[in-house]
């Protein structure tokens, strides 16, 4: 079974403290649901509410939980801690760094003459209804789960290339004399709560996670 990503590409640090706090509220609701008789959880799929029995134990396995997937009663606040989030930079830090150093928000990094090779945008997506699973099949994504009278939406933190026609533009700062380059959105698979017939089930679904530069050497013209 594939591993869920544990790290986010540099420059798109997910607000971990916020994520943990919201995840804690989900855990609390689940504990209450487990102690209640017949823990039936209503789930909303593609805008339609159906009473689907979701076993609270579905949420017990943390091993495959990705920081890019969040169950929350409220939209995640992207701009809450701007000094910690460090959304600006792409590729300026080690891939596996989990704690970013604080930077003064009044001195954004680009003032120091640092650029990302490819421009990208990141948002929490809370209205995903369908996705492609790891087998290439289209699946229905659970929009909401109602646990103990609290409605939790399923959010995905997605990163994509900002430039809609990246092949035309090339990557920033690449020597175009010797290299062909373009920016492209790359994907990863994350565990998400989906519908499997009439049951809710965890599946790996594909989401946009980074914008990277693709290089190929230009053919050398012989004299």
């Amino acid at each position: 079974e594939p591993h869920s990503e544990s790290n986010v590409p540099a420059g798109h640090t997910i607000p971990q403290a916020h994520w943990t706090k919201l995840q804690h509220s989900l855990d609390t609701a689940l504990r209450r649901a487990r102690s209640a008789p017949a823990a039936a959880i209503a789930a909303r799929v593609a805008g339609q509410t159906r009473n689907i029995t979701v076993d609270p134990r579905l949420f017990k396995k943390r091993r495959l939980r990705s920081p890019r997937v969040l169950f929350s009663t409220q939209p995640p606040r992207e701009a809450a801690d701007t000094q910690d989030l460090d959304f600006e930079v792409g590729g300026a830090a080690p891939f596996n760094r989990t704690h970013r150093s604080k930077r003064s928000s009044s001195h954004p990094i680009f003032h120091r003459g640092e650029f990302s090779v490819c421009d990208s945008v990141s948002v929490w997506v809370g209205d995903k209804t369908t996705a492609t699973d790891i087998k290439g099949k289209e699946v229905m994504v659970l929009g909401e789960v109602n646990i103990n009278n609290s409605v939790f939406k399923q959010y995905f933190f997605e990163t994509k290339c900002r430039d809609p026609n990246p092949v035309d533009s090339g990557c920033r700062g690449i020597d175009s004399k010797h290299w062909n380059s373009y920016c492209t959105t790359t994907h990863t698979f994350v565990k998400a709560l989906t519908m499997d017939g009439k049951q809710a089930a965890w599946r790996f679904i594909r989401i946009d996670t980074a914008c990277v530069c693709v290089l190929s050497r230009k053919a050398v013209r012989r004299a």
Partner: antibody, heavy 114, light 110 residues
């Protein structure tokens, strides 16, 4: 710095090219945007040209405007001006992250009248 | 389209008072929002970017907040120099530029 030029009185249908001259800005690293403002009205995003040279336009501006650039200038061509194109045209540098316009020129006034 | 709707169109405030301007995006734009201040006969000037970060040299009485689709610009302790028109702008979607700027809010200081 950013400075626009080329604004003048033109008759409808006469093509006009506005020039944005930059200094201290590497156009191979920064994208540049064109914004206009009709007298007494709000700001209207016409389009932008990426550091790689690809131009993007608002849907209403497609076919009516052409954005191009050299190493030190960005040009906006109004292909067939109409009375509604009377406005002050601003050129501005777009930051490479978060995508806002941080350095603006003073603008150049285009008046279209018969 | 990622349409930006700004309210109110005009607001009046006394010196020392507080002004609140709202900007709504038709779709989720995360925190890719900027606020600009424009005085008559001048180009717009960047005030706030990334929804809440003050641009260099901007006084702390200006505050930006919000993310997703709802954003707010608050001016506390309004001064005469704050009389201007304020615009919000989405920086998330680079293909849909039709209403990238809000309609503007004129702030009149009494």
């Amino acid at each position: 710095s950013v400075e626009e030029s080329g604004g003048r009185l033109v008759t409808p249908g006469t093509p006009l090219t506005l020039t944005c001259t930059v200094s201290g800005i590497d156009l191979s690293m920064y994208s540049m945007g064109w914004v206009r403002q009709a007298p007494g009205k709000g700001l209207e995003y016409i389009g932008w040209i990426s550091y790689g040279g690809t131009a993007y336009y608002a849907s209403w501006a497609k076919g009516r405007f052409t954005i191009s650039k050299t190493s030190t200038t960005v040009e906006l061509k109004i292909t067939s001006p109409t009375i509604e194109d009377t406005a002050t045209y601003f050129c501005a540098r777009e930051t490479p992250v978060n995508y806002y316009l941080d350095i603006w020129g003073q603008g150049t006034l285009v008046t279209v009248s018969s | 389209a990622y349409d930006m709707t700004q309210t109110p169109a005009s607001v009046s405030a006394a010196v020392g008072g507080t002004v609140t301007i709202k900007c709504q995006a038709s779709e989720n734009i995360g925190s890719y929002l900027a606020w600009y201040q424009q005085k008559p006969g001048q180009p717009p000037e960047l005030l706030i970017y990334r929804a809440s970060t003050l641009a260099s040299g901007v006084p702390s009485r200006f505050k930006g907040s919000g993310s997703g689709t709802q954003f707010t610009l608050t001016i506390s302790g309004v001064e005469c120099a704050d009389a201007a028109t304020y615009y919000c702008q989405q920086g998330y979607n680079s293909e849909n530029l039709d209403n990238a700027f809000g309609g503007g809010t004129e702030v009149v200081v009494k």
